[in-house]
Interface confidence: medium
């Protein structure tokens, strides 16, 4: 009786970690569209994954309810300051319900980063990190929007990224 | 499709001021920049400046600080460059052109047909 | 000011021969993997018209034997097979700080 518990126990206890779902989404160069839109994605290659959520054009859709620590950095860098670059650049995490026509802001950052271009160098970096706990319903989506995406450095999917998991 | 097109051929004393014109279609006027280049007669090309119709940030090349100016008017399309205090060395062929971005790189896609404008006396 | 140096000033190639031109920096264009230098092409009469962006990127609609490389301060444009359409002037220009410069323009003519 003892061995069929404790092999019970652990079948019981892989198919918690199975259903507790988590994703970490890395950027991409698909990731900036220019379109005004959500940043894109990588959800399968190198870092990325999905476990119990699913991804749609930029958004982790949430399929089971509960309270979900979401998270993301952009890494932020240039030559100079684009033109026409607004002063503060703004870098959220953002839900989409069925229940509101809208887009709600869940955690937002800004910054002023152009200002540490010097003289003798123009080239500088940023960043910014956001991350909190958020309930969400099943059905519900996240997204996370930069502006100006100009600004958001891409790479190896090290230095951009999103994710959510259930706690 | 995209379109620049700019006014017509000037001819201008020394000392007097020209302002050339540039309609954009095809496109939102307010998300792109446009430069301003020009080719004086059998030369290579010189950026003079650019505007963001946007919000009307200009930047400009040093060079032509405090001679050029350059404006937007949302409500046409239009980009204006104004050069004052002309001079014989001015004469040349003054382009605009659509600033797109590659992160924080610009580049000219679409240039307008260019405006030659000539100083004489 | 970023110097943009051209080589050659002309070039006379034969059709379907490979046409290279160069450009040096004065100073290094890069920023983060990325190059900052575009190539354009002018006919007579005509403005310039976008081939190259990023030093390697090729402009929607530019037919493929048009290839740009190179990074830090040494850029090439290679025409692969040249064709009698092709005569015309190319110019480089860093994008990496303003004023934005242009090389001096190279001739690319039919031998």
């Known amino acids: 009786d003892g061995p069929a518990g404790s092999w019970e126990q652990l079948i019981q206890e892989r198919r918690s970690h199975e259903v507790n779902p988590a994703a970490h989404l890395t950027g991409a160069n698909s990731s900036l569209t220019g379109s005004g839109g959500p940043l894109l994605w990588e959800t399968q290659l190198g870092l990325a994954f999905l476990r119990g959520l699913s991804y749609h054009d930029g958004a982790l859709v949430v399929t089971k309810a509960g309270y979900y620590y979401i998270y993301s950095k952009v890494q932020l860098g240039g030559v100079g300051c684009p033109l026409g670059l607004a002063s503060t650049i703004t870098h959220g995490l953002y839900k989409r319900t069925p229940r509101y026509p809208e887009e709600l802001e869940l955690l937002v950052s800004q910054q002023s980063p152009c200002g540490r271009a010097t003289s003798s160098s123009r080239v500088w970096w940023d960043s910014s990190f956001l991350g909190g706990v958020v309930h969400l319903e099943a059905g519900e989506e996240v997204v996370v929007r930069v502006l100006d995406e100009r600004l958001v450095r891409l790479r190896d999917g090290t230095r951009s990224y999103f994710g959510a998991f259930m706690v | 499709q995209v379109q620049l097109v700019q006014s017509g051929a000037e001819v201008k004393k020394p000392g007097a001021s020209v302002k050339v014109s540039c309609k954009a279609s095809g496109y939102t006027f307010t998300s792109y920049n446009v430069h301003w280049v020009r080719q004086a007669p059998g030369q290579g090309l010189e950026w003079i400046g650019a505007?963001?119709?946007?919000?009307?940030?200009?930047s400009y090349n040093q060079k032509f600080k405090g001679r050029a100016t350059l404006t937007a008017d949302k409500s046409t399309s239009t980009v204006y460059m104004e050069l004052s205090s002309l001079r014989s060395e001015d004469t040349a062929v003054y382009y605009c052109?659509?600033?797109?971005?590659?992160?924080?790189?610009?580049?000219?896609?679409?240039w307008g047909q260019g405006t030659l404008v000539t100083v004489s006396s | 000011d970023i110097v943009m140096t051209q080589s050659p000033d002309s070039l006379a190639v034969s059709l379907g021969e490979r046409a290279t031109i160069n450009c040096k920096a004065s100073?290094?264009?890069?920023?983060?993997?990325?190059?900052?230098m575009n190539w354009y092409q002018q006919k007579p009469g005509q403005p310039p018209k976008l081939l190259i962006y990023?030093?390697?990127n090729l402009e929607s609609g530019v037919p493929d034997r048009f290839s740009g490389s190179g990074s830090g301060t040494d850029f090439t444009l290679t025409i692969s097979s040249l064709q009698a359409e092709d005569v015309a002037v190319y110019y480089c220009?860093?994008?990496?700080?303003?004023?934005?410069?242009f090389g001096q323009g190279t001739k690319v003519e039919i031998k």
């Open positions: 052109a659509r600033g797109s971005y590659y992160y924080t790189s610009s580049y000219f896609d679409h």
């Open positions: 220009q860093q994008s990496y700080e303003d004023p934005f410069t």
């Open positions: 100073q290094s264009v890069d920023f983060d993997g990325d190059s900052y």
């Open positions: 505007v963001y119709p946007g919000n009307g940030d200009t």
């Open positions: 990023t030093a390697s």
